[in-house]
Amino acid sequence: GELETSDVVTVVLGQDAKLPCFYRGDSGEQVGQVAWARVDAGEGAQELALLHSKYGLHVSPAYEGRVEQPPPPRNPLDGSVLLRNAVQADEGEYECRVSTFPAGSFQARLRLRVLVPPLPSLNPGPALEEGQGLTLAASCTAEGSPAPSVTWDTEVKGTTSSRSFKHSRSAAVTSEFHLVPSRSMNGQPLTCVVSHPGLLQDQRITHILHVSFLAEASVRGLEDQNLWHIGREGAMLKCLSEGQPPPSYNWTRLDGPLPSGVRVDGDTLGFPPLTTEHSGIYVCHVSNEFSSRDSQVTVDVLDPQEDSGKQVDLVSAS
């Protein structure tokens, strides 16, 4: 006869490991007992369990409650056992020694491999600001056994660097993603992808990029100066900018206080029916936590009567 087993049994942490040991004997042969032992190099054999044809399953105190026979139906030539709730410390070499009649004793070894799936964590780097050089956007760390693979999935242009720390029974891998911040990266996803044989599918952690910036300010509303004449209603100036975080707006008049009746509504300055006292230099002040910008415009409210008089003069002059 001969023993049938596996060279390697692989389980994920917390799963049950079936340690196979089947005696393929000739007809009439019987198995008296199967002794299972842990036989790691440099240490003596430590009995795990003894499966006796007459006296049943005996389990070492160190494995009490964790070693069982596979569920029925059972073949009397099958000396396999179940090791419940595998932990990292169970990883190692095991030996099954089968005592048969009349053929004698047989033994076989297998290696139990316990996969420890990683629990990845993603840590954002320092605040990103437009104008910085190469900056850490995020780092991703995953520890497992064997060492996990850590990569990045993103449309953003950047560079990655990885380092690994080996522990006694596992390895921690950290990958960093560096980039040169620009406003176009705002809101873009940066995803850490962790692969490991103990995972059914890759684990993904997504970080949304936030890049602080403030665009140049400009003022709209003066495109057609001729519209700014005495008596005109609904005249307004709008301050244009964008930023992250979203900016706040403030309006002032450079050559004095804002005229009465002028309404400030965020980025918009609304005028009552125009008079010459609305002429002046107006400043839009845009700011966020990152920066501030100013834009100024000169409003010159026209008097239609003066204009028409001038036109008449021009005509008469010709």
Partner: nanobody
Framework: EVQLVESGGGLVQAGGFLRLSCAAS????????MGWYRQAPGKQRELVAG???????RLADSVKGRFTISRDNAKNTVYLQMNSLKPEDTAVYYC???????????WGQGTQVTVSS
């Protein structure tokens, strides 16, 4: 041949405890499996507990959490500590030893355990 001598049996009230000893005439370290069977009047003999030369143990479901089996290699003795005894534990307790796997076991003469209610 292995001679087995049991001791420690007796009469005890329900909830009480006893410790049975089984001294072997040769090193228990070399004995494959040792342990205890019991036989109540009119019933079949049943395995109560066993211990292997490698230190693995077995306890019948009916005694788990109440009985423990241990062994002292220096004294060539196996012990059965019986706590929280019940009237249904009343039986003659026999020590057995299987010196070599597959051989017929050696038996002690038996010791009476009686648990009164």
């Amino acid at each position: 041949e292995v001679q087995l001598v049991e001791s420690g049996g007796g009469l005890v009230q329900a909830g009480g405890f006893l410790r049975l000893s089984c001294a072997a005439s040769r090193s228990v370290f070399r004995i494959n499996v040792m342990g205890w069977y019991r036989q109540a009047p009119g019933k079949q003999r049943e395995l109560v507990a066993g211990i292997t030369s490698g230190g693995s143990r077995r306890l019948a479901d009916s005694v788990k959490g109440r009985f423990t089996i241990s062994r002292d290699n220096a004294k060539n003795t196996v012990y059965l500590q019986m706590n929280s005894l019940k009237p249904e534990d009343t039986a003659v307790y026999y020590c057995f030893a299987e010196a070599v796997v597959g051989d017929e076991p050696y038996w002690g003469q038996g010791t009476q355990v009686t648990v009164s209610s």
